[in-house]
Interface confidence: low
């Protein structure tokens, strides 16, 4: 490295971009696993991603901060994208999340290690 | 308390159209999106379609695409569903349900000559 | 089209049994899976939601367990009210698809 140039941490976290297909994939699957664990009648989505970070290990591990806004689809109804969101005051209801999602890619499995949620 | 009102009955020519209608009342309209069940006398369910209220978006069943079309009149809460070139195989029970936590008690819908 | 092939299309229980119905999926839809009954003459009515959440006002004997292709309701000790038929639905995509129905009669 140059000088004057502290060292790359080797598997340090790094920003990632949202665009990216591994982020992309971990989003959903977060977001995925977020409505299974909830008992809301309604589904969230992400409104946006503050944050993306990844971290190459043995896989990879996705660091994801993420505003989730509650949709207007019920029940048994898809989780699906095109799911608007609520526009009602007594039905709008936000929460921010920091997921930690670890992909192994070239096994095709993904696991939420960590997720913390609070309203918003 | 929270209310779907279908007409009781249709009875209809072949080859015309209909317009079933579906008035919600008791919450909040747009908050559900409505969709539309089939059952054919002593037969199981079948999904149409859905509408969602606030915006207008519609996801139909691919057979229905050209039988039916689902539009929405937020200033009386109520759904509609339009069937054409009706035939003795449309003759059904049409259910509306909101979100599939409510439903109207259906309308019998009779193609006959 | 997601198919859901339900089991059986008809069964006869005794007050005192414990009966499951399965649904299977042609495709894995997570746990978007709803239970719905329908009394004889009457309208459906939502059972169970995602999989395993129970709707309100269900009586607590009906359960729902699965995820991905294979689900199960289950009916501790049925009782007379609960003769009717009962549906499952998969919510994972477009178009929505119901199984084909479990008649249930009570001996």
């Known amino acids: 490295s140059s000088p004057g140039k502290p060292p790359r941490l080797v598997g340090g976290p790094m920003d990632a971009s949202v665009e990216e297909e591994g982020v992309r994939r971990a989003l959903d699957f977060a977001v995925g696993e977020y409505n299974k664990a909830s008992n809301d009648m309604y589904h969230s989505r992400a409104l946006q991603v503050v944050r993306a970070r990844k971290q190459i290990v043995a896989g990879v591990n996705y660091f994801l901060d993420v505003e989730l806004g509650r949709t207007t689809c019920t029940k048994t109804q898809p989780n699906l994208d095109n799911c608007p969101f609520h526009d009602q005051p007594h039905l709008k209801r936000k929460a921010f999340c920091s997921f930690q999602i670890y992909a192994v890619p070239w096994q095709g499995t993904m696991t939420l290690s960590k997720s913390t949620c609070q309203d918003a | 308390q929270v209310q779907l009102q279908q007409p009781g009955s249709e009875l209809v020519r072949p080859g015309t159209s209909v317009k079933l209608s579906c008035r919600a009342s008791g919450y909040t309209f747009t908050s559900y999106w409505m969709h539309w069940v089939k059952q054919r006398h002593g037969q199981g369910l079948e999904w149409l379609g859905n509408?969602?209220?606030?915006?207008?978006?519609?996801n139909y069943e691919e057979n229905f695409k050209t039988k039916g079309t689902l539009t929405v009149d937020t200033s009386s809460s109520t759904v509609y569903m339009h069937l054409s070139s009706l035939t003795s195989e449309d003759s059904a029970v049409y259910y509306c349900?909101?979100?599939?936590?409510?439903w109207g008690q259906g309308t019998t819908l009779t193609v006959s000559a | 089209d997601i198919q859901m092939n339900q089991s059986p299309s008809s069964l006869s229980a005794s007050l005192g049994d414990t009966i499951t119905i399965t649904c299977h999926a042609s495709q894995n839809i997570n746990v978007w899976l709803g239970w719905f009954q329908q009394k004889p003459e009457n309208i459906p009515k939502l059972l169970i939601y995602?999989?395993?959440t129970l709707h309100t006002g269900v009586p607590s004997r009906f359960s729902g367990s699965g995820s991905g292709t294979v689900f199960t309701l289950t009916i501790s000790s049925p009782q007379p009210e609960d003769i009717a038929t009962y549906y499952c639905?998969?919510?994972?995509?477009?178009?929505?698809?119901f199984g084909a129905g479990t008649k249930l009669e009570i001996k």
């Open positions: 509408v969602d209220p606030g915006s207008g978006t519609t």
């Open positions: 639905q998969q919510g994972q995509t477009y178009p929505l698809t």
């Open positions: 349900t909101a979100g599939f936590d409510y």
């Open positions: 995602k999989a395993s």
